[in-house]
């Protein structure tokens, strides 16, 4: 058993039929010695008396908020949560496996630049009695500070018969060094509590590996005289690291016909303009990627040819 | 050329070669997200590689103030990786394919390090750790780790030379 926060404790249980469970001793936080009774959750049924209560925690029925009282007055509370371990593996019932980029990916994170700011998100089908708490650091043995905000519900989607909820959190490295080569990964730890079930999820990454620039901005077409060619121009996204002479992007320009089956013409360039042939009913799209490190491409920015 | 005492390197040449190094490093080990090498334990093998750290002056301001600190750190790293790529980690079993980019990568590391430090001038270099994995699978894993680490190192070096070429070239 360990303390998650004040008056909230996590009991780690091996979860199998007829498991012995864990013996837990709760102590009433009071100078009083006599006339103390204990109750659990939303009930007046007395579970024991005395300054301490010894319970054998085996199932979710044994978890919950234990309260000690004297003469009708509440003295203190202890909330017990359960963390299940099945076949040596901690349960992952609360969050959905996103399966990208690999199986058992519960947390996904992205950064728009090298400033040390990043966003992580996760999915669940649970809609109520759900709380998250996020901590992060650079490295684990001698951790350096990363500050995370509160996790918030960022999207709701309908997937077949189920509703899916996306939560996200923004974090910022306290003393970020955008130009340095990272040697210690960022560690992100999410505590999830659903009713009386506790689970924790972790992700470890370098900012450089989760970079995904915003799409190029101000995408414009300039027709060239006496030609089917157009000059496409764009700018670096506002959110990208500066100076651009140091934090450079490379770009992919694509001409796509109306039909998905039509052949796509692609040009790669380090410049912020390119000359392409604009077909009727086609559209021109541009996306960006770090020039020197192959992290994710941005989403496409698009304009119609006409 | 970056002479230990002072003059500027051939920024544009260094920029071109470092960008080529980036391309080669990624073609040598393209499968990025599919193998999280940090999960594979064995940390000590890649802990000793030289990293371009915050105080090394490789940021735009540091380069403007005095690029020598940064160039020296890059040079150390290039020599270190060049030695690693020439070691039995890469020459031993399992043999690299004949058209493997590792050979070109090795030559380009050497080329860039010579651009930064011509014969006769010596910056102190970092001692290469004695890594001689016994099993072929250990060697393969170590190659992946080294290439992964090299990708991060040459990305920073390429940024330095691109910025230098754009803002510090005479």
């Amino acid at each position: 058993i360990w303390e998650l926060k004040k008056d909230v404790y996590v009991v780690e249980l091996d979860w199998y039929p007829d498991a012995p469970g864990e013996m837990v001793v709760l102590t009433c936080d009071t100078p009083e010695e006599d006339g103390i009774t204990w109750t659990l959750d939303q009930s007046s049924e007395v579970l024991g008396s005395g300054k301490t209560l010894t319970i054998q925690v085996k199932e979710f029925g044994d978890a919950g908020q234990y309260t000690c009282h004297k003469g009708g007055e509440v003295l203190s509370h202890s909330l017990l949560l359960l963390h299940k371990k099945e076949d040596g593996i901690w349960s992952t019932d609360i969050l959905k496996d996103q399966k990208e980029p690999k199986n058992k990916t519960f947390l996904r994170c992205e950064a728009k630049n090298y400033s040390g700011r990043f966003t992580c998100w996760w999915l669940t089908t649970i809609s109520t009695d759900l709380t998250f708490s996020v901590k992060s650091s650079r490295g684990s043995s001698d951790p350096q500070g990363v500050t995370c905000g509160a996790a918030t519900l960022s999207a709701e989607r309908v997937r077949g018969d189920n509703k899916e909820y996306e939560y996200s959190v923004e974090c910022q490295e306290d003393s970020a060094c955008p130009a340095a080569e990272e040697s210690l990964p960022i560690e992100v730890m999410v505590d999830a509590v659903h009713k009386l079930k506790y689970e924790n999820y972790t992700s470890s990454f370098f900012i450089r590996d989760i970079i995904k620039p915003d799409p190029p901005k101000n995408l414009q077409l300039k027709p060239l005289k006496n030609s089917r060619q157009v000059e496409v121009s764009w700018e670096y996204p506002d959110t990208w690291s500066t100076p651009h002479s140091y934090f450079s992007l490379t770009f992919c320009v694509q001409v796509q016909g109306k039909s998905k089956r039509e052949k796509k013409d692609r040009v790669f360039t380090d410049k912020t303009s390119a000359t392409v042939i604009c077909r009727k009913n086609a559209s021109i799209s541009v996306r960006a990627q770090d020039r020197y490190y192959s992290s994710s491409w941005s989403e496409w920015a698009s304009v119609p040819c006409s | 050329r970056a002479v230990p005492g002072g003059s500027s390197p051939a920024w544009t040449q260094c920029q071109q070669l470092s960008q080529k190094l980036c391309t080669l490093a990624w073609s040598a080990h393209p499968l990025v997200g599919h193998m999280d090498l940090r999960e594979e334990g064995d940390e000590e093998t890649t802990n000793d590689v030289p990293h371009i750290q915050c105080g090394d002056g490789c940021d735009p301001q540091g380069l403007r103030d005095n690029s020598q600190f940064c160039l020296q750190r890059i040079h150390q790293g290039l020599i270190f990786y060049e030695k690693l790529l020439g070691s039995d980690i890469f020459t031993g079993e399992p043999s690299l394919l004949p058209d493997s980019p590792v050979g070109q990568l090795h030559a380009s590391l050497l080329g860039l390090s010579q651009l930064l430090q011509p014969e006769g001038h010596h910056w102190e270099t970092q001692q290469i750790p004695s890594l001689s994995p016994s099993q072929p699978w250990q060697r393969l894993l170590l190659r992946f780790k080294i290439l992964r680490s090299l990708q991060a190192f040459v990305a920073v070096a390429a940024r330095v030379f691109a910025h230098g070429a754009a803002t510090l070239s005479p």
């Epitope: 009774t37 939303q42 007046s44 049924e45 007395v46 579970l47 024991g48 199932e59 029925g61 978890a63 | -």
Partner: antibody, heavy 112, light 107 residues
Framework: QEQLKESGGGLVTPGGSLTLTCTVS????????INWVRQAPGKGLEWIGY????SPYYADWAKGRFTISSTSTTVGLKITSPTTVDTATYFC??????????WGPGTLVTVS | LVMTQTPSSTSAAVGDTVTIKCQAS??????LAWYQQKPGQPPKLLIY???TLASGVPSRFKGSGSGTDYTLTISGVQREDAATYYC??????????FGAGTKVEIK
Amino acid sequence: QEQLKESGGGLVTPGGSLTLTCTVSGFSLSTYDINWVRQAPGKGLEWIGYIYRGSPYYADWAKGRFTISSTSTTVGLKITSPTTVDTATYFCTRNLYSVNVLWGPGTLVTVS
Amino acid sequence: LVMTQTPSSTSAAVGDTVTIKCQASQSISSRLAWYQQKPGQPPKLLIYSASTLASGVPSRFKGSGSGTDYTLTISGVQREDAATYYCLGSYSNTIRTFGAGTKVEIK
């Protein structure tokens, strides 16, 4: 003296609505669980649900069929659309499986 | 939560020992009570918290058990002990279930 007394039983037609009342005296409702338990003629005891500090909790089989509510001195049990299977003696109890257990005498409901 | 109570009925002579068992479908961590009910009366609490004797109950009644298995033992049964006995278990406080009952007859 601490006691509970059920009222409101009697003959009811199927589909009609019926509310039983448990009146408590000698103790405060806010301090205890008040349970409703029923017993069909010649059958065993069946727990319906309870209320504690205004929050009701029900047996799975009873959800939607019964509504438990409270005022400062009474606890109500509303039987929605009773059928013949709801014919039983209905008891209210203070607590069930620890100290301070107290049962009312019960009230008979006949659905016919 | 299902409480399986055995036997459904038993017959004993005065002075015999009667044993009634109750098995919960899930661990109920001693949140268990035993009741005695005689015809035309509300049930009377005998044992609570699996083994604590309720006030005014003769000491021949004894409760034991933990987890999912519980027992009520009547040592030296008396004529006035003829009644139906019920166990009641509680999983997570908010889920409570009675056993089906055991009818005890005195020969």
